[in-house]
């Protein structure tokens, strides 16, 4: 046994952890055969020359969440076996040139959550084996050309949460092995053509929460392996027709929180692997035919919180695998009876917070697997006869906050609700708006014998109970499905983020199943 500093804990002598505010300098003596050293939550403010000189076998060094603001250039001398170095969550403003010299085995370098103002090509010129470089959460305003030129093996680079206002088109040109590039939460207004051309192995590109207004038409044309592209919360007002044409591997695309006004047919695709498309919080006013027709595998399409007032009957052509469609909080007044006809696998549809006055009787005709329909807060006075007849899996139907007209024509809907209540959850009950004598009364307990006759033909056909199960017992009252936890945005699955915020904000999703991808 080679001894362990009193302020540290050593497990099997090769793993050392030193924590606590009483520590103000690197503890000594450290076991010479230590392979992992963690110095966390201390009051160390500086690293002097060679504090780790006698532990040359060290493979992983974490110096995190300290008061560290100054490092001597030779602080990491003699650590030739070091593969993982984290200086994250300190107070570093400047990195001395040559700090990482001699770290020939270094593969992961974490400098995130400091106060770094700049980086220079000389900082990383010796780190030829580096695979992961984390620089997010600093104060970087620009990246000089050549900063990463020697990092030819780099696979993951995170520059998010800095103050970058522009990117040189040459800065990433030598990073042919890069798989993940994160530039989220900066101040980028545009990205020059060619910036990503050298990134032929890129799988994830995170550009969300910048101020990008325009995308160059060929910006992603060399990124054939891209799987995840995050463009949300920018200022993008239009998409060049060919911008997404060369992304056959893409399976996640987020465009929510932009200023998109229209989507041209064929803009998305071909993207045979795209599973989710997030377009909420834009200014889209209409959806033309075939706008999503290349997205054959799409399962989640979020179009809520736009200004959509018109959907062409063929807008959803090709979406045969779609499971979730969110159209809530738009300006829809009418829907064509065939608009959802192609969505044979649709399970959840949210249409709440629109201006729908009526629905065609065949609106859900081919969507036999629907489990949840949200129609609350529209202008519906009644629903067509038999609209839900065939929906044997329906177990959540929200109809409240509509101006239901409770004359005798409402009886079929009222009966359908009553006979199917064990399958429809326990949500807020629909309430009559007219005529005046029943205003405010629950639609399902109005006195049918004083219901005002309608002005239409007296013989009213009715909703059969759905589904008819002559040979099975009725549903138990546990059939009400699914959590209504909803995400405000897709979880962008960053392993280097310490926390991922998920909220219960129903205003965005309007869905019954939270999708985290």
């Amino acid at each position: 046994y080679h001894g362990c500093p009193s302020e540290c804990t050593c497990s099997r002598a090769s793993q050392v952890e030193c924590t606590g505010a009483r520590i103000v300098a690197v503890p000594t003596p450290l076991p010479w055969n230590a392979m992992s050293l963690q110095i966390l939550n201390t009051h160390i403010t500086e690293l002097n020359e060679s504090p780790f000189l006698n532990i040359s076998a060290l493979i992983a060094l974490r110096i995190e969440k300290n008061e560290l603001s100054r490092i001597t250039p030779g602080a990491f001398r003699n650590l030739g076996s070091l593969r993982y170095l984290s200086l994250a969550n300190n107070k570093l403003q400047v990195l001395p040139i040559g700090l990482f010299q001699g770290l020939d085995s270094l593969e992961s370098l974490l400098l995130s959550s400091n106060q770094l103002l700049q980086i220079q090509p000389a900082h990383f010129s010796q780190c030829s084996n580096l695979k992961e470089l984390q620089l997010h959460g600093n104060h970087l305003e620009y990246i000089p050309d050549g900063a990463f030129d020697h990092l030819v093996g780099l696979t993951k680079l995170n520059l998010g949460k800095n103050s970058l206002t522009h990117i040189s088109p040459r800065v990433f040109q030598h990073l042919g092995n890069l798989q993940v590039l994160r530039l989220y939460e900066n101040r980028l207004t545009d990205i020059p053509m060619g910036t990503f051309d050298g990134l032929v192995n890129l799988q994830e590109l995170a550009l969300q929460q910048n101020q990008i207004g325009l995308l160059s038409p060929g910006l992603f044309h060399n990124n054939h392996n891209l799987q995840r592209l995050y463009l949300s919360n920018n200022h993008i007002s239009q998409l060049p027709p060919s911008v997404f044409m060369q992304l056959p591997q893409l399976n996640r695309l987020t465009l929510f929180g932009n200023s998109l006004k229209e989507l041209s047919p064929g803009i998305f695709g071909p993207m045979p692997n795209l599973r989710e498309l997030w377009l909420y919080d834009n200014h889209i006013s209409s959806l033309p035919d075939n706008v999503f027709s290349n997205l054959r595998q799409l399962q989640v399409l979020i179009l809520s919180r736009n200004q959509i007032s018109f959907i062409s009957p063929g807008a959803f052509n090709g979406l045969t695998e779609l499971r979730e469609l969110s159209l809530h909080t738009n300006a829809l007044q009418d829907l064509d009876g065939n608009v959802f006809r192609m969505l044979a696998n649709l399970q959840n549809i949210s249409l709440q917070n629109n201006r729908l006055r009526q629905l065609p009787g065949n609106i859900f005709a081919n969507v036999n697997g629907l489990m949840a329909i949200q129609l609350q807060n529209n202008q519906l006075e009644n629903l067509p006869l038999g609209i839900f007849d065939h929906l044997g899996k329906l177990c959540e139907l929200r109809l409240y906050d509509n101006p239901w007209r409770c004359d005798s024509d409402i009886l079929p809907l009222r009966n359908w609700l009553l006979l199917n209540q064990p399958r429809l959850g326990t949500d807020t009950v629909p309430v009559c708006f007219s005529p005046a004598n029943v205003r405010g009364q629950s639609l399902i307990i109005i006195n049918v014998n004083v219901a005002v006759p309608s002005v239409h033909v007296p013989e009213v056909p009715s909703y059969p109970e759905t589904p008819w199960y002559p040979d099975t017992p009725s549903y138990p009252d546990t059939t009400s499905v699914s959590s209504t936890t909803e995400l405000t945005s897709p979880v962008e699955d960053y392993t280097d983020l310490t926390t991922i915020q998920v909220t219960d904000d129903r205003s965005v999703w309007g869905m019954t199943q939270a999708q985290s991808g």
Epitope: L418, Q421, T426, V460, P464, W468, S474, D477
Partner: antibody
């Protein structure tokens, strides 16, 4: 006014079937559920089934023995109970609407050998 | 099945006095915030008559002295001032789920 008029009393032997009718008038026939309920002599009420727009739901206790049908042209609902046994002796009522707001006068079915 | 238990089995009340009948369900009969509990009156030789639906709503033509209350599993039918014509058997019934089930009945007589 709303009326439900049922067919007359029946006497049946065990194992036989009985078909009771319920003719509705005074309202839009297709807009309401029709239930069947029975009451054995001196006993309480037991729900059998309902029919609505040709769809039916049955009490499990009667499944396989009871069949409900309707004829919209005559606004009539029929309830047929098969494989009769003595304990099926009861007054059989039809009733309208989900909340059973109007009832027929009842049909006494006696099962006796 | 939901089991409905009525109490008392019989009740003798003076004319003009209040009569109270209780009904307990073996599980909640609430949905949408509404209690699917109904009350019926049956006089000898007659079919039942709807008095109260959805716990507290009066059926058509039912005198105001009949009222219903309760939620969840416990419900009450109250006749505020018993009249001679109120002598009958009273049944509670749940219509929350199939099979719709009735209580055993409470016979109300004049003391």
């Amino acid at each position: 006014q709303v009326q439900l008029v049922q067919s007359g009393a029946e006497v049946k032997k065990p194992g036989a079937s009985v078909k009771v009718s319920c003719k509705a008038s005074g309202y839009t026939f297709t807009s309401f559920v029709i239930h069947w309920v029975r009451q054995a002599p001196g006993q309480g009420l037991e729900w059998i089934s309902y029919i609505y727009n040709d769809g039916t739901k049955y009490n499990e206790r009667f499944r396989g023995r009871v069949t409900m049908t309707r004829d919209t042209s005559t606004s009539t609902v029929y309830m047929e109970l098969s494989s009769l046994r003595s304990e099926d002796t009861a007054v059989y009522y039809c009733a309208r609407d989900y909340y059973f707001d109007y009832w027929g006068q009842g049909t006494l079915v006696t099962v006796s050998s | 099945d939901i089991v409905m238990t009525q109490s008392p089995d019989s009740l003798a009340v003076s004319l003009g006095e209040r009569a109270t009948i209780n009904c307990r369900a073996s599980e909640s009969v609430d949905y949408y915030g509404i209690s699917f509990m109904n009350w019926y009156q049956q006089k000898p030789g007659q079919p039942p008559k709807l008095l109260i639906y959805a716990a507290s709503n009066q059926g058509s033509g039912v005198p105001d002295r009949f009222s219903g209350s309760g939620s969840g599993t416990d419900f009450t039918l109250t006749i505020s001032s018993l009249q001679a014509e109120d002598v009958a058997v009273y049944y509670c019934q749940q219509s929350k789920e199939v099979p719709y089930t009735f209580g055993g009945g409470t016979k109300v007589e004049i003391k």
